[in-house]
Structures are given as C-alpha cells and as structure tokens.
C-alpha cells in the first residue's frame, strides 16, 4: 500500500492533491489565483499542490497554478499568499492512527480544514472528516497547467529543468504498509463512472492511499466507495 503521507523526502517533486473523504464524497483542497481556498469534488489545476517537508514535521504547501503558499491567519482562516511568512505559512503535519493526515498552524494551533469552523488541534483528538486529509497523485495532464518554459541561455536543450521547470514529470514514489488495522484496498470509484463523463480522468482514482475500519481517534474512519 502506498504511504499515507504525501511527504516523500525533503522536497518531493511530484504534484499531489490533498483531499478530505467520507464514505460518500471527497473534496480536494484548492488554492485559487485570487488566494481563496476551498474544496472541489474533483482534481482541478488549482488543487495541484507541491508539499515541501522541513525539519520537525513542518511542511510548506504551495498551489502550483496560483503560485501561492497556503497560509493561515490568527483567526484560523486559510488563504493563499504570494508572500511566504514563516509564521503563517508553515504547518505541522501529523499522521493520525487512522492513516489520515492533519495539518495545523504551530503559531495559531488551528487545523487546516475545508469546513468553515475553526478548530484547534489537540493531541489525541478525532478531528471532523473535513479536517483530515489523504493525498492523491496528480492525474490532470500536465499540458493543462500551461507552465511557461523559461528561455534557455547557456544550458543544454536536454537539461531536465528546462523541459520540466516545476519538476513534476518524474515524481518519486515510496511504498510502505498502512497501519495494519486500517489497510484495506478499496474498489476504484471509477467503477460506475464512464470515461465519457470524465474524459480527463480527473475525478477519482489514483489514490495514494485508502483506509478503512472502525471509528474514533484510535481506529479508522469508515471509508466506503466514495464518488
């Protein structure tokens, strides 16, 4: 089973999407060009993220298309900012025992959430599902990101960084077992979704991880086939 965490080393090159999930639905965190942050039921170019891990479990999350950092204000509101403020734009990442990831501000202690309520993170707590995230590899064709290629100066035309300025073409993968109590491969949610209705294949599937099991902070949230 792929690793629950999107943090595959100190600077993982691949694009990922963070999404919340219940038994029936899921929302992908997206950072819009105007800095607004919300959730979408499917992968979008604005939900494609790069997550850089730093020391002591801190992470920096960036929206690739908006070119904005995910940040949080003192009230717990999340927003995208072009300016990186270490106090507001770094989050503590923690993987819960159910295999889901939570992100909270070390400065203000609020959880990153797609719900509207602002809740402080407390060790051992069982956050609501819209504050717990899983990660999924990007499935949107890179052409949709329309990233301008920088002008070449002295570098060779074969230079990888020239052809792939965002370093997204060759994401590294790491396979580790999910918690034993949680590991359960689930059917793809595309089973009942014909390609005709999703030609880009951006709505479901390609999950980096799936978990199932009991409820509560010690167990795993019910995780049926969501759409």
């Amino acid at each position: 089973y792929p690793n629950a965490s999107p943090l595959l080393g100190s600077s993982w090159g691949g694009l990922i999407h963070l999404y919340t999930a219940t038994a029936r639905n899921s929302y992908h965190l997206q950072i819009h060009k105007n800095g607004h942050v919300d959730g979408a039921p499917h992968q979008t170019i604005y939900s494609a993220l790069m997550i850089r891990s730093e020391d002591a479990g801190f992470v920096v999350i960036t929206g690739v298309m908006s070119r904005r950092y995910l940040c949080m204000d003192f009230r717990g509101n999340i927003f995208g900012s072009h300016y990186f403020d270490p106090e507001n734009c770094r989050f503590q990442h923690q993987t819960l025992e159910n295999g889901y990831d939570v992100y909270h501000s070390p400065q203000y202690h609020f959880l990153v959430s797609l719900g509207r309520a602002k809740r402080a993170f407390l060790p051992g707590m069982n956050p609501p599902p819209y504050s717990q995230f899983l990660s999924r590899r990007n499935e949107i064709p890179l052409i949709h990101f329309n990233t301008p290629i920088p002008r070449r100066h002295t570098r060779s035309a074969e230079d990888d960084s020239e052809r792939d300025p965002l370093n997204v073409l060759k994401p590294r993968a790491r396979m580790t077992p999910a918690p034993a109590s949680c590991s359960q491969e689930l059917p793809s949610a595309e089973d009942n979704s014909p390609m005709a209705s999703d030609p880009l294949g951006v709505v479901r599937g390609g999950r980096v991880n799936t978990h199932a099991g009991g409820t509560g902070p010690e167990g795993c949230r019910p995780f049926a086939k969501f759409i």
Partner: antibody, heavy 117, light 106 residues
Framework: QVQLVQSGAEVKKPGASVKVSCKAS????????MHWVRQAPGQGLEWMGI????????SNAQKFQGRVTMTRDTSTSTVYMELSSLRSEDTAVYYC??????????WGQGTMVTVSS | AIQLTQSPSSLSASVGDRVTITCRAS??????LVWYQQKPGKAPKLLIY???SLESGVPSRFSGSGSGTDFTLTISSLQPEDFATYYC????????FGPGTKVDIK
C-alpha cells in the same frame, strides 16, 4: 445568490416512474456535490443519495439501490432524480440540497410526488 | 451506519423559555453534526454546522454544543417564530438525519 429551483408536483400511479429536476444558479455548479432528501407526510427527513456534479457518479442509500437514478446536465446546471417502481410509500416531498462540506447549506423548495391508484 | 436519536421527540414550551434538544450518535462523529429547523410546508433551514458554529443570519439565541456522541441544541429564549421541528444530521460517514423534535406552543 444561490438558488435551487425544483420542478412542479407530480401525481403517479403505482409501478410508474417519476423524474424530478433541480436547477442550480448563483454558484459554480461543478464545485459542490448535490444530495436528494425526501420527507413523507408527517415524517422525518430521509437521505436518498448524492451525485458528483462533474463526473455524474452517484452513491445512494441502501434502501434506494436499484430504484433511484441520479443524473446531471452541466450545460444547464441541473440535477435530476428518477425514482422507479413507485409505491404508495413513496408519496413524499423530494428535496435537492447543496453539499457545503460541513452541512447542506441550500435546499430546493421541494417537489411533492403523490403515488395513488 | 451511524444512527442518530433525538430527545425529546416533541416538547411544549412558551415564548421566552429556554429549550434544549439533544442528539446522540451511535458512534463517535467528532464535531461533524448539523442542526436544521423546518417549518410546515417549507424546506429545512441550516442553523448550526460543525456542532457549534452558527450559520450566517441565524439569531444568536440558537447555540450548539457537544462532540463525539452527545450533542445539544439550545434556544436561549424561545420566540414565536421558533415553533418548528428541529433535526440533527451527521456528516461523518454518511448523511442520515435524526428523527426530529417538534417544538410547539404550550
């Protein structure tokens, strides 16, 4: 402002099917799941199912498996709920409701479906 | 599936009364609980989300509390327009509703 406008009341015979529509406006249609909830006369609210607005994928409550079909038309920002093999117990008001991640924040006005021979 | 129970199923109260309605989940649902108000012939109206957050435009006399399995909706001073049926709903693993509590005039 967000609005969900449903189709008018229907009277159907047992065994027939009914198709109720819900037209959304005032927001980006593909950014929110849509739900269907029904309420029999004098009874409580009963969740029926959910549709993903961009893929058309659906997930229904066990009770309605095989009898309910939810579809959507993104060009008109409309979702549809068709219930087949109607019986008298299906007499109810049917609501569409928008998913706001942490609640159903906007509801249609409801469509009364009466099943009677 | 997680089941929700509400108590009481109905209650009679007077204008100005403090009213408390409880909702209990069969398993822990964190704070993923919602309260709605419904009046006859109308669609439900969102009051409280995430167990305790007041929806925009809802009077402050409404409040919610609880986490895990036990939740409460409180109306601090009942007003004439508050006579209605109140439903809880969980957003944790499914979207089922409680059976409702009818608040009528004493």
């Amino acid at each position: 402002q967000v609005q969900l406008v449903q189709s008018g009341a229907e009277v159907k015979k047992p065994g027939a099917s009914v198709k109720v529509s819900c037209k959304a406006s005032g927001y980006t249609f593909t950014n929110h799941y849509m739900h269907w909830v029904r309420q029999a006369p004098g009874q409580g609210l009963e969740w029926m199912g959910i549709i993903n607005p961009i893929s058309g994928s659906t997930s229904n409550a066990q009770k309605f498996q095989g009898r309910v079909t939810m579809t959507r038309d993104t060009s008109t920002s409309t979702v549809y709920m068709e219930l087949s093999s109607l019986r008298s117990e299906d007499t109810a008001v049917y609501y569409c409701a928008r998913d706001a991640v942490d609640a159903f924040d906007f509801w249609g006005q409801g469509t009364m479906v009466t099943v009677s021979s | 599936a997680i089941q929700l129970t509400q108590s009481p199923s109905s209650l009679s109260a007077s204008v100005g009364d403090r009213v408390t309605i409880t909702c209990r989940a069969s398993q822990g649902i964190s704070s993923a609980l919602v309260w709605y108000q419904q009046k006859p012939g109308k669609a439900p109206k969102l009051l409280i989300y995430d167990a305790s957050s007041l929806e925009s435009g809802v009077p402050s006399r409404f409040s919610g509390s609880g986490s895990g399995t036990d939740f409460t909706l409180t109306i601090s001073s009942l007003q004439p327009e508050d006579f209605a049926t109140y439903y809880c709903q969980q957003m944790y693993d499914d979207f089922n509703f409680g059976p409702g509590t009818k608040v009528d005039i004493k």
